[in-house]
C-alpha cells in the first residue's frame, strides 16, 4: 500500500513539475529591464527565451520574437536546449510511469517489469529536473555576470552626445517557476526510485526443491535442506537424493515466490 502511495505521489509531483517546466520555458518573464534614469516615458521591458516584450504605462503590451540565431548569446541557446531536453525527458518519463503505475493493470505485466519501468521513469524525472534547474541557473548566472548592472556610455555620430545609462536587470517570474518546477520533478523522480525498490520482488537465496520418491529405498541424507539458509554445503542446489529428488530447474515447474514445497 505504501509503495503504491509513494509511486502515485511521485507521479503526481513529477507531473506538476513537468507542467511547471513547460510553463517556465514558454513564459516571457525570464528577465526584466529597468532604466534608473529613464528620460522619456514609463516603459517596462521583459524578456523570455523566445521573445522580448514591452509594456507601457497605458497597458499596451507588444512582443517580438528573436528571429536571428546568430545574434543570440551561446548561453541563451544552451538554456533553450537544457529546457527542451528537460521537457522531452519528462514527457517520456510520464509516459513510461503511467504504464508502471501499480494501480493500473496492463495485461499480465509482472511486478519486476513495473519495477524496472518505475526506476526508468524515476531516473528520467531526476535528469529532467536537473536539466531545468541547470537551465534556469545558467540564465540567472548570465544575467548576474553579463547584464546585471550594465552602465553604458552611448556615443551617437561624430561629436555626438554622451549619455550614461544604468540598465538594471532583475530575475523574472519564470526563473522562480523553473527552479520550483525542476525541484518538484527531481523530488518526484526520487520518489519513483524509492517506490521501485518496494515493487521489485524479493529474491530468495534458494530454489525450492520438490521431492518425488520413487520407492522405499530412498536414502535420506541429513542436511539436505541446509540450502534454505543460503550458507550450507548445498547452496548450488546439487542433487542430494538419488531417488528421484530433482531441483525445480530440472522439473520445469515455476511456482511463484509464495509457493513453498
Amino acid at each position: 500500500m505504501a509503495v503504491t502511495a509513494c509511486q502515485g505521489l511521485g507521479f503526481v509531483v513529477s507531473l506538476i513539475g513537468i507542467a511547471g517546466i513547460i510553463a517556465a520555458t514558454c513564459m516571457d518573464q525570464w528577465s526584466t529591464q529597468d532604466l534608473y534614469n529613464n528620460p522619456v516615458t514609463a516603459v517596462f521591458n521583459y524578456q523570455g527565451l523566445w521573445r522580448s516584450c514591452v509594456r507601457e504605462s497605458s497597458g499596451f503590451t507588444e512582443c517580438r520574437g528573436y528571429f536571428t540565431l546568430l545574434g543570440l548569446p551561446a548561453m541563451l541557446q544552451a538554456v533553450r536546449a537544457l529546457m527542451i531536453v528537460g521537457i522531452v525527458l519528462g514527457a517520456i518519463g510520464l509516459l513510461v510511469s503511467i504504464f508502471a503505475l501499480k494501480c493500473i493493470r496492463i495485461g499480465s505485466m509482472e511486478d519486476s517489469a513495473k519495477a524496472n519501468m518505475t526506476l526508468t521513469s524515476g531516473i528520467m524525472f531526476i535528469v529532467s529536473g536537473l536539466c531545468a534547474i541547470a537551465g534556469v541557473s545558467v540564465f540567472a548566472n548570465m544575467l548576474v555576470t553579463n547584464f546585471w548592472m550594465s552602465t553604458a556610455n552611448m556615443y551617437t555620430g561624430m561629436g555626438g552626445m554622451v549619455q550614461t545609462v544604468q540598465t538594471r536587470y532583475t530575475f523574472g517570474a519564470a526563473l522562480f517557476v523553473g527552479w520550483v518546477a525542476g525541484g518538484l520533478t527531481l523530488i518526484g523522480g526520487v520518489m519513483m526510485c524509492i517506490a521501485c525498490r518496494g515493487l521489485a520482488p524479493e529474491e530468495t537465496n534458494y530454489k525450492a526443491v520438490s521431492y518425488h520418491a520413487s520407492g522405499h529405498s530412498v536414502a535420506y541424507k541429513p542436511g539436505g535442506f541446509k540450502a534454505s539458509t543460503g550458507f550450507g554445503s548445498n547452496t548450488k542446489n546439487k542433487k542430494i537424493y538419488d531417488g528421484g529428488a530433482r531441483t525445480e530447474d530440472e522439473v520445469q515447474s515455476y511456482p511463484s515466490k509464495h509457493d513453498y514445497v
Epitope: 532604466l35 516603459v43 507601457e56 536571428t68
Partner: nanobody, 122 residues
Framework: QVQLVESGGGLVQPGGSLRLSCAAS????????MGWYRQAPGKQRELVAA????????NYADSVKGRFTISRDNSKNTLYLQMNSLRAEDTAVYYC???????????????WGQGTLVTVSS
C-alpha cells in the same frame, strides 16, 4: 552601432511652423519610446515631448501643449515634431532621444542625437 539623425531645424519667424524629424538606424531590435528635448543657451536641457512607439502614448511639456505635435512612423523608425505658432522662447538646440532595445538578445539603452538648431526670430 545605433545612429540618430535629426533634420528640419532652421530660422523661422515668430508664429511660423517647422517640422523636425529624427531617423534611428543600426542594430535596433525595437523602439520603446522616443522624445524631443531642447536646450536654450545658458539653460538646462528640458523635455519637449515624448511618444511610446508601441501604443503611441504621448507626453508634452506644459509650455508647448496645443502648439507642438509629436508623431512617429514605426516602419521607418522615425520620429517627428510638428511645431506651430513658434515663439522667440522656443529658440534652442533640439535633441532627439531614443529608448531602444539593441542587439539579437536585446539590451535596453538610451541614445541621443547630435541636435538641430531652431531659431525663432523676426
Amino acid at each position: 552601432q545605433v545612429q540618430l539623425v535629426e533634420s528640419g531645424g532652421g530660422l523661422v519667424q515668430p508664429g511660423g511652423s517647422l517640422r523636425l524629424s529624427c531617423a534611428a538606424s543600426g542594430s535596433i531590435f525595437s523602439i520603446n519610446a522616443m522624445g524631443w528635448y531642447r536646450q536654450a543657451p545658458g539653460k538646462q536641457r528640458e523635455l519637449v515631448a515624448a511618444i511610446t512607439f508601441g501604443g503611441g502614448s504621448t507626453n508634452y511639456a506644459d509650455s508647448v501643449k496645443g502648439r507642438f505635435t509629436i508623431s512617429r512612423d514605426n516602419s521607418k523608425n522615425t520620429l517627428y515634431l510638428q511645431m506651430n505658432s513658434l515663439r522667440a522662447e522656443d529658440t534652442a538646440v533640439y535633441y532627439c532621444n531614443a529608448d531602444l532595445l539593441v542587439g539579437g538578445f536585446p539590451r535596453r539603452n538610451v541614445y541621443w542625437g547630435q541636435g538641430t538648431l531652431v531659431t525663432v526670430s523676426s
